[in-house]
Amino acid sequence: PEPPTACREKQYLINSQCCSLCQPGQKLVSDCTEFTETECLPCGESEFLDTWNRETHCHQHKYCDPNLGLRVQQKGTSETDTICTCEEGWHCTSEACESCVLHRSCSPGFGVKQIATGVSDTICEPCPVGFFSNVSSAFEKCHPWTSCETKDLVVQQAGTNKTDVVCGPQDRLRA
């Protein structure tokens, strides 16, 4: 028969014949022959291969370097790489999470709309009328102005997006 020019899925062409690829978690030791199957060997500890392959070496698991604020989110297996995430107070700079940056703080006049996670930064929003934030924070939302009326007081100084209103006693009308 004619030698194949293409092979089925999970096979590869070598020496004019189709050999089985090694399954994820295993590396190639020797190609198949007319008389023998492809020989594969499991990846060693702290190694992986995540696809059907003909690699002769497995890949090292990623190192989540604490110097960079990284820690292991999910331990690697023979078929998957280690997944890193950032320590508390940091977030990844990319999807691959190879480095971290400190969470952004929302300046006075802005409040936290969404608290940062290990993979996303803080989202800030301007404090609308009736709300304020007088601190730089990665956690604080905009606070509503104090309601002087409910305390039987009057507004002595108007609030801003950075300051609360100042309440004071009502002027007594003299008889």
Epitope: H61, P66, N67, G69, E87, L102
Partner: antibody, heavy 129, light 112 residues
Framework: QVQLVESGGGVVQPGRSLRLSCAAS????????MHWVRQAPGKGLEWVAV????????YHADSVWGRFTISRDNSRSTLYLQMNSLRAEDTAVYYC??????????????????????WGQGTTVTVSS | DIVMTQSPLSLPVTPGEPASISCRSS???????????LDWYLQKPGQSPQLLIY???NRASGVPDRFSGSGSGTDFTLKISRVEAEDVGVYYC?????????FGQGTKVEIK
């Protein structure tokens, strides 16, 4: 006092195996990442491998990857380097070193890095036929 | 991998005089938290390496204040304000930003 003591070195033929140990004392071993660094005769320092404090995460230099494996036993406060398929170029003094660290630094970093702050006295590995 | 280059490789010094060693990295060691991940180590004759400086400019515990580290990004310097006889040995810089860690070739400091 804080101390690291390596052992397990010796003369071995090419292709054979050797396991180095590094016994830690005077500190909470399970809290620290650990490194192996080697020095060939008359040469400079070469980084070999690192392992996280819990042993779940490790990384090896390309020159030894696939032949050497770093591991640790926190219950014994001991770091290991399993060396297989040894070559003449692996001849060196092998040092274990501790990754110094502290609690949060002033800039909000989670683990403040203090360098490789404690080193062992080294153990000599000679690969020769 | 990050390549570390030291100069000079040999430095004859006179006791009481200042000395300076340069270390250059093939990429910036300045991280997003504002720290430079560069260490300096000294290996005295017949001894293990010992940490002198971490994060570019921080003196390790017990290191005399005649040693100082400076620089940022890719260019770093170790200075000894007044060399003493006990300062002889080989000085190494090491980057701690990337795995694998990499060392400079070493600078041998000896008394003239």
């Amino acid at each position: 006092q804080v101390q690291l003591v390596e052992s397990g070195g010796g003369v071995v033929q090419p292709g054979r195996s050797l396991r180095l140990s590094c016994a830690a004392s005077g500190f909470t071993f399970s809290s620290y990442g650990m490194h192996w660094v080697r020095q060939a005769p008359g040469k400079g320092l070469e980084w070999v491998a690192v392992i996280s404090n819990d042993g779940d995460n490790k990384y090896h230099a390309d020159s030894v990857w696939g032949r050497f494996t770093i591991s640790r036993d926190n219950s014994r406060s001991t770091l290991y380097l399993q060396m297989n398929s040894l070559r003449a170029e692996d001849t060196a003094v092998y040092y274990c070193a501790r990754r110094g660290m502290g609690s949060s630094g002033s800039r909000g970093d989670y683990y403040y890095y203090y360098g490789l702050d404690v080193w062992g006295q080294g153990t000599t590995v000679t690969v020769s036929s | 991998d990050i390549v570390m280059t030291q100069s000079p490789l040999s430095l004859p010094v006179t006791p009481g005089e200042p000395a300076s060693i340069s270390c250059r990295s093939s990429q910036s060691l300045l991280y997003s938290n504002g720290y430079n991940f560069l260490d300096w180590y000294l290996q005295k004759p017949g001894q293990s390496p010992q940490l002198l400086i971490y994060l570019g400019s921080n003196r390790a515990s017990g290191v005399p204040d005649r040693f100082s580290g400076s620089g940022s990004g890719t260019d770093f310097t170790l200075k000894i304000s007044r060399v003493e006889a006990e300062d002889v040995g080989v000085y190494y810089c090491m980057q701690a930003l990337q795995t694998p860690r990499t060392f400079g070739q070493g600078t041998k400091v000896e008394i003239k």
